[in-house]
Interface confidence: medium
């Protein structure tokens, strides 16, 4: 069986807004659901369609869906079908319409002391209640000779005199919502003793300290009286005069005069004009002090030729709005053209280099006037001045390449190096121009390098190879002091490059030949067995052709190299006790005994009262506590060589001798006891 | 006549997922009925938490559907509530209920449980 | 969502006398979407009046509901003992539906 697990209900909807009505269905098989409004099938629109098995109202329309809906769910295969239970719309709307004159049935009727009644032709549902109004002053019951229900759409003036003229509007809500008249009634019943309005004040904008004019002109049998008054109702007459518009001055056809205006002058003008009979007529006008506020900056703007470009300015704020107009050259631009004015933006079409320069965009009022320039480049692409030559730089000295371009706005030169962008560093520097220098030329930097020249309007570029002139120099130097190990073979190695390899010998620094156990093999000095007296000043002279020579200066020592006469051993030492790591080594020259302990070197002059290194390099610490536990390293060096070894020092609780024990049982671990 | 009855536990810590089942008797949770969740703070109104219908369609509460799910199993004849991110705000009675069959008002309601968020 | 209010928070009557209980919604109520419920303390609530105005199984004649677009009535005509309790109304007419915060019925 076909179920509705959601039903369809009646509701309240309102004009032009947004309604659903629901509709959920269940069945064994598949179902299609379709809509009935009084019993004939809904067609979909765009405002009012199916969404799901629900029916959607983008807008509820109070004549399209007006009626009964019902959601039908229809079994294609077995025509089973079920229907939902009916809903409608209870739909709120409210239609604004004309105030007209209901009696008489003419203007031309309209006499003093007659009855006339109009009517407020706004409908609606649910029906509104209406409010009547004179001159848009709400009119309540039961005043000044006239009726008026707020069920009541029917306004009646009985009888109708001078007093009720004025134009009638009303306005009617709703539940829904609220309208007004969409056209008013001007009832105009003559009473030559009430003041009519000849001439109206008019709200003024001046500028400071200029004059400013209110005209205000009544008439009626016999001639009414005329007031002005300001904001704060004071009257201003030609005898009394309020402290702040001591300046004014009101002239016999009603006129008011006020010069020299100052701030404290801006405000609400009001002229009252007052018949022998009938009410009061005011009439307000605004007196405003123009104004206009500085205008921002803009910023300098760069263009590219043959493109079309905007520059829109923001007029200043004032009072009154302030014109705007461009300018170029002390001329003002025209609305049309390639170079004009459209709105308040310049524009500029298809750009020539001669567009470039200062333009100003000018805005004024009565307040003043203010301008505010945009500077204008027209970018062009970069030219040469000079390119970058393939060059050959000497090692170790400034190398510098050249870019030299020129161009609108000034271009931005970027180096590559080997295709990689050069960034700069110690080494590398581009100066303003575009030139590249090389700090310290290094033999690695012979490549390839290109230059790239740019502004908005396009780039160029160029590239040129860098050969590298090697210098004359030792590779690596030799080390000033060498040691060789007395009784020994020994080599001495000694190498150098340079634009043309270079010779390498040895000689000795007193100018004396070599001894012939000694030989000068390609640069490296060769020592078969070495003795006391090959100590001494050798000198290696490295030379070519177009360099000349170079020296370096070795001083080779003959040494015993170091060995350990006595090494630290593993020592177990109780706390409190005194340990003793020995070590001893010898070589030539004779060699230094250094302590590290716990990872830092232990200095014999900052040692305190518990440690002592001894002549002979052994070291003694007092009074043994945990803390002292760990590795100890003993360090041999002399001027040729240094050697270390290390042993682990372990500090332990004296064991309590237990019985089984007799006085001479020894430790289960080497020991120094003291 | 229709029963509900809720079960979960009544101690749920801050920022953990409160998890309740609502067991359905007397009927069959597959009747054209939607079932939804319920909760009412001591001492204050009630709050629509969702509801599901037995094919496994639901419709959640905008102000907590990021946090919620229901969920249903024929099987057992019962549908569960889980509510993620728990704060000391959702301490409430939580009473599962029965819609009427098309409409969005409660004919049937469980005598709920109190869940409270507490470290 | 539409939000209900229900005045007043607290309703002080003698057993016997009539008790109007007000509900409010935030925007139009089709008057097919509204319910009332009563909840008696430690209790879940228990449905009275659903449709603005039909009594659910079970209902004493004695309550009555009433109302249309945003402005519903609860009436009970003679309150019995057991009537002094907790009122809740619900609109169910727009998703998420909504209930009031409730009237309390005092014994005087």
């Known amino acids: 069986a076909i179920v509705f697990i959601k039903q369809p209900s009646s509701q309240d909807a309102l004009q032009g807004r947004r309604a659903l009505l629901r509709c959920e269905v269940e069945a064994p098989g598949p179902v299609h659901v379709y809509w009935l409004l009084d019993g004939a099938p809904v067609q979909d629109t765009e405002r009012r369609f199916a969404q799901g098995s629900s029916l959607s109202f983008a807008a509820v329309d109070r004549l399209q869906d007006s009626g009964t809906f019902q959601c039908v769910a229809r079994d294609d295969v077995t025509g089973e079908e079920a229907r939902s239970a009916n809903a409608s719309f209870n739909i709120k709307w409210i239609e604004a319409g004309p105030v007209v004159l209901k009696h008489p049935a003419s203007e031309a009727e309209i006499q003093p002391q007659t009855q006339v009644t109009l009517r407020c032709h706004i409908d609606g549902h649910p029906r509104p209640t209406y409010q009547w109004f004179r001159d848009g002053t709400p009119l309540s019951d039961g005043q000044s000779n006239h009726t008026v229900s707020s069920k009541e759409r029917n306004l009646t003036l009985r009888p109708a005199g001078p007093e009720h003229s004025g134009l009638y509007s009303c306005c009617a809500h709703s539940a829904f919502g609220q309208a007004c008249s969409s056209q008013n009634f001007t009832l105009s019943i003559a009473d030559e003793s009430f003041a009519r309005v000849v001439l109206a004040p008019q709200d003024v904008v001046v500028a400071r300290y200029e004059e400013a004019m209110f005209h205000c002109q009544f008439s009626a049998q016999p001639p009414p009286s005329l007031q002005w008054l300001f904001e704060d109702e004071t009257p201003i007459t030609n005898r009394s005069r309020p402290p702040h518009l001591r300046r004014a001055t009101v002239f016999a056809n009603g006129s008011l005069l006020l010069t020299q205006v100052r701030p404290r002058n801006a405000g609400i003008y009001r002229c009252i004009g007052q018949g022998q009979r009938g009410p009061p007529i005011i009439l307000e006008a605004t007196l405003h002090l123009a104004e206009i506020e500085d205008m921002p900056l803009f910023e300098p703007r760069v263009f590219t030729a043959g493109s079309e470009e905007r520059v829109t300015c923001l007029p200043p704020k004032g009072l009154p709005e302030p014109s705007v107009w461009w300018e170029h050259a002390g001329v003002r631009l025209p609305t049309h053209g390639r170079v004009y004015q459209k709105g308040h933006e310049l524009v500029l079409a298809n750009i020539a280099e001669s567009d470039a320069g200062v333009y100003t965009c000018h805005a004024a009022n009565l307040a003043g006037q203010r301008r505010q320039d945009v500077n204008i480049t027209v970018a062009t692409v970069p030219s040469w001045l000079k390119k970058p030559q393939d060059s050959q730089l000497e090692e170790g000295k400034p190398g510098y390449l050249d870019c030299l371009t020129q161009a609108t706005p000034k271009p931005t030169v970027v180096w590559y190096r080997n295709q990689m962008l050069i960034s700069e560093d110690s080494r590398f520097e581009v100066f303003k121009n575009g030139t590249l220098r090389i700090n310290s030329v290094e033999v690695y930097d012979g490549t390839w390098y290109r230059c790239m020249s740019s502004t908005p309007a396009g780039s160029i570029e160029a590239q040129a190879r860098v050969q590298v002139l090697e210098k004359l120099k030792f590779t690596p130097p030799p080390q000033p002091q060498q040691c060789m190990e007395f009784d020994k073979e020994a080599t001495v190695p000694c190498s150098a490059t340079g634009r043309e390899k270079p010779t390498i010998k040895w000689e000795r620094a007193d100018g004396s030949s070599l001894p012939e156990w000694v030989t000068d093999n390609a640069g490296t000095l060769h020592f078969a067995r070495v003795t006391r007296d090959d100590a001494g000043n050798y000198t290696c002279i490295a030379s070519n052709g177009p360099q000349g020579q170079i020296r370096a200066h070795v001083q080779l020592t003959v040494a015993v190299f170091i060995t350990f006469k006595v090494e630290p051993e593993r020592t177990t030492v109780y706390q409190g006790h005194t340990a003793l790591l020995q070590c001893e080594a010898q070589g030539d020259p004779k060699p230094l005994i250094q302590w590290k302990g716990k990872d830092r070197i232990l200095d014999p002059t900052k040692l305190g009262p518990r440690m002592h290194i001894f002549q002979n390099g052994s070291l003694v610490i007092h009074d043994v506590a945990p803390e002292d536990s760990g590795r100890y390293t003993c360090i041999a060096g002399n001027s040729c060589n240094i050697k270390h070894t290390e042993a682990p020092l372990y500090v332990v609780d004296k064991p309590v001798p237990e019985e089984s024990e007799g006085p001479g049982s020894p430790p289960p671990y080497k020991m120094i006891q003291t | 006549q229709v029963q509900l009855q809720e079960s979960g536990p009544g101690l749920v810590k801050p920022s953990g997922t409160l998890s309740l089942t609502c067991a359905v008797s007397?009927?069959?949770?597959?009747?054209?009925?939607?079932w939804s969740w319920v909760r009412q703070p001591p001492g204050k109104g009630l709050e629509w938490i969702g509801e599901?219908?037995?094919?496994?369609?639901?419709n959640y509460n905008p102000s907590l559907k990021s946090r919620v799910t229901i969920s249903v199993d024929k099987s057992k004849n019962q549908f569960s509530l889980k509510l993620s991110s728990m704060t000391a705000a959702d301490t409430a009675v939580y009473y599962c209920?029965?819609?009427?069959?098309?409409?969005?008002?409660?004919?049937?309601w469980g005598q709920g449980t109190l869940v409270t968020v507490s470290s | 969502e539409i939000v209900v209010t229900q005045s007043p928070a607290t309703l002080s009557l003698s057993p016997g006398e009539r008790a109007t209980l007000s509900c409010r919604a935030s925007?139009?109520?089709?008057?097919?979407?509204l319910a009332w419920y009563q909840q008696k303390p430690g209790q879940a609530p228990r449905l009275l009046i659903y449709?603005?105005?039909s009594r659910a199984t079970g209902i004493p004649d004695r309550f009555s509901g009433s109302g249309s677009g945003t402005d519903f009535t609860l009436i009970i005509t003679r309150l019995e003992p057991e009537d002094f309790v907790v009122y809740y109304c619900?609109?169910?007419?727009?998703?998420?539906?909504?209930f009031g915060q409730g009237t309390k019925v005092e014994i005087k």
């Open positions: 209920a029965r819609d009427e069959s098309g409409y969005d008002y409660f004919d049937y």
């Open positions: 007397g009927g069959s949770i597959s009747s054209i009925n939607w």
């Open positions: 599901i219908y037995h094919s496994g369609s639901t």
């Open positions: 925007q139009s109520v089709s008057s097919s979407y």
């Open positions: 449709g603005t105005s």
């Open positions: 619900q609109q169910y007419g727009t998703s998420p539906r909504t």
